[in-house]
Interface confidence: low
């Protein structure tokens, strides 16, 4: 018996062009939820085959509404783990299917609409009781980051959770770090690998990376004698000497991280975040120094007096990152206003402004019509950063300087004759046709083919079109 656990870290647009901006359709806000399906074995199974090892559904995530101008973010996720309990043996090899579903919250007839957004399938080998396995998978244009593990529950042990281990109160002939198992009480079960350095005599673990102490011992590796301890409310198998256990300290007690590293607890273990220049499980190894020249792009390296001390890169303008290895994309902040084009020249930013705008950031809106006279009685119309002339009849062109012959385009249909007029043009229609452009035939019975007569006029009434 045991449980498979899945933790979704992030779901969002993958890298590269064409990444979607929003998981929601145009119909409005939506929220995400996940479904996990476990199938035994590594074979390529049909998508419809049952989730023989179990399945689970997450809660709904927070409502997401797309911000039109904002960059596409990692999307808000449901809280908590997805847990798939299994009653029988853990198979070791399995197929993991994670589906990301969208619940649309627009005005749907009959309630919310669900649609499958992404589906990833991983065929994996995984022993129960092991550490969290991290993974990143792409599904189309989406990227999913997640961790998973299988752990035994109750008294089950082993990589398949098939063996039952009964804690015994009597002293055991098993060696240090080994525990007796039932029903085969003369067999010793090898425990998982404890935290490195965990005392074999005074410590034990039930999960990898853990170190819990026997009565009378303390410290992250159970190497420090404890002055006093109580046996009240203790859990875990009894000690062969005193019949009780003290629970081990938290993984970060006493800060196992050297060289100023900060400790954070992880399931059953700890993780050190090391300062610059140090690495290793406990930040115990001094790695990169200024002597290695780790600062790129003209960054200035500053180290301590000790040759093995950490380094800090002071980056020149336009670069960032712990090694000044990343060029700052200063245009990503969209400093150019009014649609100006941003150019990062390295030493400076330059905005190339659209017509009608000026200034270092295109912030000044020029008077589009200032100093722009429209000839021949035309009027200047401002808009969109460029001036436009609305020309008087008979004139055209950008500044109304060109003479326009209104009859040049032969606007009168069906053989009508065109006459240029001070207010435009007039069509003299051939017999049997009417309309401002002679476009409508007049029927022999006097009823025109106009789709609808203007108010106050009946089809067939004489009409004058200018």
């Amino acid at each position: 018996a045991g449980v498979f656990e899945l933790q979704i870290h992030s779901f969002g647009p993958g890298p590269g062009p064409g990444a979607p901006r929003s998981p929601c359709s145009a119909r409005g806000p939506c929220r995400l939820f996940f479904r996990v399906c476990l199938k035994p074995g590594l074979s390529e199974e049909a998508a419809e085959s049952p989730c023989a090892l179990g399945a689970a559904l997450s809660a709904r995530g927070p409502v997401y509404t797309e911000q039109p101008e904002a960059p596409a973010p990692d999307l808000p996720l449901p809280n908590g783990l997805l847990q798939v309990p299994f009653r029988d043996a853990w198979p070791g090899t399995f197929s993991l299917i994670i589906e990301t579903w969208r619940e649309e919250l627009g005005d749907q007839i009959g309630g919310p609409a669900w649609s499958l957004l992404a589906r990833v399938t991983r065929r994996r080998r995984l022993a129960a009781g092991g550490p969290w396995a991290r993974d990143i998978q792409r599904a189309g244009a989406w990227e999913l980051r997640f961790s998973y593990r299988a752990r035994c529950e109750l008294l089950a042990v082993g990589t398949a959770c098939t063996r039952l281990c009964r804690p015994r109160s009597a002293p055991s002939r098993c060696g240090p770090g080994l525990r007796p198992c039932a029903p085969l009480e003369d067999e010793c079960e090898a425990p998982p690998v404890c935290r490195a350095g965990c005392s074999l005599e005074h410590g034990f673990c039930e999960q990898p990376g853990e170190c819990r102490c026997l009565e009378g011992w303390t410290g992250p590796l159970c190497t420090v004698p404890a002055s006093t301890s109580s046996c009240l409310g203790l859990r875990g198998p009894s000690s062969a000497t005193t019949g009780c256990l003290v629970p081990g300290p938290g993984p970060c007690d006493g800060n196992p991280c050297a060289n100023g590293g900060s400790c954070s607890e992880t399931p059953g273990s700890f993780e050190c975040t090391c300062p610059r220049g140090f690495y290793g499980l406990r930040c115990e190894v001094s790695g990169v120094t200024c002597a290695d020249g780790p600062c790129f792009n003209g960054g200035l390296c500053v180290g301590g007096a000790d040759p093995d001390s950490a380094y800090i890169c002071h980056c020149p303008p336009g670069f960032q990152g712990s090694n000044c290895e990343k060029r700052v994309d200063r245009c990503s902040l969209q400093p150019c206003r009014n649609g100006g084009l941003c150019l990062d020249l390295g030493h400076a930013l330059r905005c190339r402004c659209r017509a009608g705008f000026a200034g270092p950031r295109c912030e000044h809106n020029l008077d589009d019509c200032a100093g722009r006279a429209c000839a021949n009685g035309g009027t200047c119309v401002e808009g969109g950063g460029a001036h436009r002339c609305s020309c008087a009849l008979g004139f055209g062109g950008r500044d109304c300087r060109e003479r326009a012959d209104p009859c040049a385009a032969r606007p009168c249909a069906h053989g009508g004759r065109c006459y240029a007029h001070f207010s435009g043009l007039v069509c003299a229609c051939a017999p049997g046709y009417m309309g401002s452009r002679c476009e409508f035939p007049v029927h022999p019975d006097g009823v025109s083919a106009l789709p609808a007569a203007p108010p106050g006029l009946r089809p067939g009434d004489p009409q004058r079109y200018l």
Partner: nanobody, 118 residues
Framework: QVKLVESGGGLVQAGGSLRLSCTVS????????MAWFRQAPGKERQLVSL???????VYADSVKGRFTLSRDNAHSTAYLQMNGLKPEDTAMYYC????????????WGQGTQVTVSS
């Protein structure tokens, strides 16, 4: 989980060349700063070369001009081209990786042995 697999080590005569490869799985390679360290028997582990996510590299003084570190994001692999090898380059060579948001090299390969005979 993140896995680094090195290859390309071996025995070579002084003045010869080798190309070490380090292939990464389980993580987006583009987001990793890659490095090669080496450790000779009885000596401290030392940085040989480091290549940032942008592709620019730094080298230990002892290998400058002879070693070239490059990365092939499409194949999730970092290559250390070693020319003009010297007996003092003999060591176990380890590939290491870290994300570009932290400073500790958290991911390590098993190492590949390079032996340069005179």
């Amino acid at each position: 989980q993140v896995k680094l697999v090195e290859s390309g080590g071996g025995l070579v005569q002084a003045g010869g060349s080798l190309r070490l490869s380090c292939t990464v799985s389980g993580f987006t390679f583009d987001d990793l700063v890659m490095a090669w360290f080496r450790q000779a028997p009885g000596k401290e582990r030392q940085l040989v070369s480091l290549v940032a996510t942008a592709g620019n590299s730094v080298y230990a003084d002892s290998v400058k001009g002879r070693f070239t570190l490059s990365r092939d994001n499409a194949h999730s692999t970092a290559y250390l081209q070693m020319n003009g090898l010297k007996p003092e380059d003999t060591a176990m060579y380890y590939c290491a990786a870290r994300t570009d948001s932290e400073h500790a090299f958290k991911f390590w390969g098993q190492g590949t042995q390079v032996t340069v005979s005179s």
